[in-house]
Interface confidence: low
């Protein structure tokens, strides 16, 4: 899954956790990265890249504790890294990459973390202890489980799947900008000797933002845009702005070579070597940088910033974005990539512009209506009362508002027409000497899951349309499917007739059009994340989990899912855990997540599995995983033997002992049994979980599970006197399945 | 329950060093922060720097950098500081503060009772 | 750093009446929906004590006389009703931003 910088999953936690079983396996090459935060007013386990290593805070009740990867381990290197955190029996154990690199002893008591899992990053999460935790993760989560429940399902629609390409994507790969609300953040851009931006620019947007660099104190900034076609660039500093334009228009689709450069004199800005200056008045000064250098668009706060000033340089769509891209991208002299962003929205590696679309002037005299509104309109407060001047023909007596507004019904997925009953003028028309065709409406923000479709040559770029187009159905609302139930659009209404009304007509009136979306229920469907081929080792079993199928199913939750395995129940290799032996042709999507059936292949052949999925009124289609049986490879990964001192006890770690096998994603049983005598000692195992103080065993076998938990030793137990150092040849045969590899 | 026990007072010399110490008990010394702050005869309060004990990780305010030395031993759960080339402005009394988990970066919640450093020829 | 202003420096009041204390930030305090602002109490002779933190938040063991309020870079702390024992300087404190910083402190005075 790809998380771009600002987002982030949550996952709720039904009851406290005892035991944690954390694996996670990420790459990102920013060196701050919040991975993991389960959350309690007090309590809390924070998992984060900082200066590129991994902190693990653990908070029980009024203790902390904190593990760390070594400061010479950098994790933020873009390669996939997996991490184990356990705690078990009051001890925890961090292990990234298969080493163990830090464990402790923690207090005994359940984790309380009613709030839940946070997933890449903390959304709105205002708690105290979040202070000073790293940025959310820009980077890719590969795989995340708690206790064997998958963290990743479901995804959220800003949440990708998989990994997206610009997180690999080189200094000379292009920041693609593919509207309409792109925005790629960077490190903040210093200015303080002199600062310097350039860039390779490709668009065809007449207005947009380009950068935007806020300041220490309150107002000041640096913003450059495409205003009307050409370059400009503002700054703001303290009570001074300074605003430059360059004459060589940009928005024609060609690569256009773009230099910013600033220092406490002047201001300079150059497009295709062609430069702009201020006078050397010495009015800039140092601009201190707060936050983040934005480029091809704006975050809410610097729209605000922009709204707030004084020259109105609010673009013609605050939220809007450049549409196009930007090439050979330098900041003070450095190159930057799209791998180096903080955050990104709606952006692609490398440069695809779109077409453009069909322009048509007869709306050209209104282009100042389509400003976007702002993020949250306080819903019963539209539109403002209009009170009418003094002097206006009766039909304006008791005048308030132009438009009577009813919900536009649509099933979801499904379009529905905008008509006159909608929009229904509060006032006689042709009375008050208005046609139809001279009420204006602006989209001034559209709905969240659809798009109002103008069948009006030009118009769907501006968003703008008439009353007479309403009633000759030329504006039809088409659903994206999606399951909210309510949705709006925002429309500024205006009216351009040249007879008398009341001036608020003229200015326009903003209206809430409240869209109410009829549920349909969508069926299920199963998916393969990794493919729907499955391998598994010869005479083994192997979980069957969400990683291998799930269902999808935007209107139902997990719970009332249930998988049906389709064929002959008789050698059906699919059982639950706990049923050994026992067919499993039914299953809940619940067991499914819980990790509680295994594929199980006793010889042969390996059986394709045929599922599906039903919601209760709806099945999905049938789905085959194909199963291949692969006979077991075994090979050392590593045996170094053991250096102790005699009478003293060693004990067996992966870093001394493990094979590695031909498993697939597939945990599987690896077998070691001592196969001769020894002669100085005893190897052993350790009984109860491997809790401290349990009692070891003189053992002939143990599994690389048993190593991998700290629960295997060689115990020395040789009372004679030598002069010189013993060996003790220790001889293993280690079985994967039927597999054996013998004389380890 | 949760005492800081400080050091007694230190008469010390302009140029030379003072070492302070603060023992903690009540609670788990290593994963705690622990602050220094300091307090000139009559006036406010001034915040040094904090370390973690755990793992000796530390910050400072910058205008102590270099004036102050935070050190913890998590045997004895007694922090330390050390504040070197002494003048008459670092007379004050110098409290060590438990820093809550809760409230991150830690309101000082339990605090010693000061130890008052007098530079004086 | 974000300095804290303190008002009034010294301020007395009678016994059983209401005591305002006001403290301004050079900039906000605000993060992730709090305010990092906490109020201290320090007699003379001893350490400060916690009384109020994330700006309304009353810490264990304080009397309900003690309330805080406020958000961004304006709070106040507020001790209704006065009592004798309430003699002492108050701090206020924010830790969003490194170095944590004091405001000057206000001296009240029981008549």
């Known amino acids: 899954a790809s998380f771009f910088g600002e987002n982030h999953l949550e996952v709720p936690v039904a009851t406290a956790l005892t035991d944690i079983d954390l694996q996670l396996q990420f790459s990102t090459s920013q060196p701050e990265a919040l991975l993991l935060l389960a959350a309690g007013p007090a309590d809390h386990l924070l998992l984060q890249l900082y200066s590129g290593r991994l902190q693990v805070r653990l908070v029980l009740g009024q203790e902390e504790l904190r593990l760390q990867t070594p400061a010479e381990t950098l994790l933020s290197d873009s390669i996939p890294h997996t991490v184990v955190l356990t705690v078990v029996e009051g001890w925890a154990t961090l292990s990234v990459d298969g080493f163990l690199n830090a464990s402790s002893a923690v207090p005994g008591a359940p984790l309380e973390v009613p709030y839940g899992l946070f997933v890449g990053g903390t959304g709105t999460l205002g708690l105290p202890y979040l202070r000073g935790t790293s940025r959310p993760l820009r980077g890719c989560l590969h795989a995340a489980t708690l206790n064997g429940r998958s963290l990743l399902r479901p995804l959220t629609p800003d949440v990708h799947e998989g990994c997206a390409e610009e997180f690999s994507a080189s200094d000379d790969v292009a920041l693609g900008f593919s509207g309409p609300h792109s925005l790629a953040a960077f490190p903040a851009w210093g200015t303080q000797d002199e600062g310097t931006l350039e860039f390779t620019l490709t668009t065809q947007s007449r207005q947009a933002p380009l950068a935007f660099q806020a300041g220490g104190r309150r107002g000041d900034f640096i913003y450059v845009d495409i205003f009307e076609g050409h370059l400009r660039a503002v700054v703001e500093k303290g009570q001074g702005t300074v605003l430059l334009h360059n004459s060589v228009p940009v928005a024609d689709g060609q690569p256009h070579e773009v230099s910013v450069h600033i220092n406490a004199h002047r201001l300079e800005i150059s497009v295709d070597q062609y430069p702009t200056h201020t006078s050397n008045r010495g009015v800039l000064s140092y601009l201190e940088p707060r936050g983040s250098l934005l480029l091809g668009g704006l975050d809410a706060e610097a729209s605000r910033h922009l709204q707030e000033h004084r020259l109105g340089l609010t673009p013609e769509a605050t939220n809007a974005s450049l549409l196009g891209c930007m090439e050979d991208l330098s900041v003070n002299g450095q190159r930057r990539g799209l791998r180096e962003a903080l955050l990104t929205r709606n952006m692609a590696a490398g440069c695809r512009l779109e077409e453009e679309e069909y322009e048509d002037d007869a709306y050209g005299h209104y282009e100042a209506f389509s400003t976007l509104a702002p993020e949250a309109w306080p819903a019963m407060e539209l539109p403002e009362p209009c009170v009418p001047e003094p002097g206006l023909p009766p039909v304006f007596a008791n005048f308030t508002q132009l438009l009577t507004i009813s919900p536009l019904v649509v099933a979801e997925g499904g379009t529905a027409w905008l008509e006159w009953r909608h929009v229904q003028p509060t006032l006689d028309l042709m009375e008050a000497e208005l046609r139809k065709s001279q009420v204006l409406f602006s989209v001034t923000r559209g709905a969240r899951h659809g798009e109002l479709e103008l069948d009006i040559p030009g118009a769907q770029a501006r968003k703008m349309f008439t009353l007479l187009d309403v009633v000759n159905r030329k504006a039809r609302f088409i659903h994206d499917g999606s399951e909210d139930t309510s949705d709006q659009l925002v429309l500024e209404v205006s009216v351009t007739a040249r007879v008398p009304m009341p001036s608020c007509l003229r200015r326009g009136q903003t209206y809430l059009l409240p869209i109410q979306v009829n549920p349909v229920n969508d069926p299920p469907h199963i998916i393969f994340p990794h493919g729907s081929l499955m391998v598994i080792l010869e005479h083994t079993q192997k979980p069957l989990g969400p990683e291998v199928f799930q269902a999808y199913d935007p209107d139902s939750a997990c719970e009332g899912l249930t998988f049906q395995v389709l064929g002959t129940s008789s050698g059906l290799p699919v059982e639950r855990r706990d049923q050994p032996g026992e067919p499993a042709t039914e299953f809940s999507c619940r067991e499914l997540e819980a990790g509680s059936l295994v594929y199980v292949h006793r010889g042969g052949p390996a059986q394709d599995l045929t599922f599906r999925v039903s919601d209760g009124l709806q099945a999905s289609p049938p789905a085959t995983l194909k199963v291949v049986a692969i006979r077991p490879a075994i090979q050392i990964h590593r045996s170094t033997g053991l250096r102790l001192a005699q009478g003293s006890a060693m004990p067996i770690l992966p870093a001394n002992l493990s094979v590695e096998t031909n498993a697939v994603g597939q945990d599987v049983s690896v077998l070691f049994r001592v196969t001769g005598a020894l002669q100085f000692g005893e190897l052993q195992k350790q009984g109860a979980g491997g809790v401290e103080g349990a009692e070891w065993w003189a053992t002939q076998a143990f599994h690389q599970r048993d190593v991998e938990q700290g629960r295997v030793r060689y115990l020395s137990t040789d009372p004679q006197h030598h002069a010189y150092d013993t060996v003790e040849n220790l001889a293993l045969e280690v079985q994967v399945g039927q597999e054996i590899l013998s004389n380890l | 329950q949760v005492k800081l026990q400080q050091s007694g007072p230190e008469l010390v010399k302009p140029g030379a060093s003072v070492k302070i110490s603060c023992k903690a008990s009540?609670?788990?010394?290593?994963?705690?922060?622990m602050n220094w702050v300091k307090q000139r005869p009559g006036q406010g309060l001034e915040w040094i720097g904090r370390?973690?004990?755990?793992?000796?990780?530390?910050n400072y305010n910058g205008k102590f950098k270099g004036k102050a030395t935070l050190t913890a031993d998590k045997s004895s759960s007694t922090a330390y500081m050390q504040v070197s080339s002494l003048t008459s402005v670092d007379s004050a009394v110098y409290f060590c503060?438990?820093?809550?988990?809760?409230?991150?970066?830690?309101?000082?919640?339990?605090w010693g009772q000061g130890t008052t450093v007098t530079v004086s020829s | 750093d974000i300095e804290l202003t303190q008002s009034p420096a010294s301020l007395a009041v009678s016994l059983g009446q209401r005591a305002t204390i006001s403290c301004r930030a050079s900039?906000?305090?605000?993060?992730?929906?709090?305010?990092?602002m906490h109020w201290y109490q320090q007699k003379p002779g001893q350490p400060p004590k916690l009384l109020i933190y994330?700006?309304?938040n009353l810490e264990s063991g304080v009397p309900a006389r003690f309330s805080g309020s406020g958000s961004r870079t304006d709070f106040t702390l507020t001790i209704d009703p006065v009592e004798a024992d309430d003699a002492a300087t108050y701090y206020c404190?924010?830790?969003?931003?490194?170095?944590?910083?004091f405001g000057g402190g206000t001296k009240l005075e029981i008549k």
């Open positions: 503060a438990r820093g809550n988990t809760v409230v991150v970066p830690y309101t000082m919640d339990y």
């Open positions: 009540g609670y788990a010394f290593s994963r705690s922060w």
């Open positions: 370390i973690y004990p755990g793992d000796g990780d530390t």
């Open positions: 900039e906000s305090v605000d993060s992730y929906g709090n305010s990092f």
């Open positions: 994330l700006a309304s």
């Open positions: 404190q924010q830790n969003n931003e490194d170095p944590l910083t």
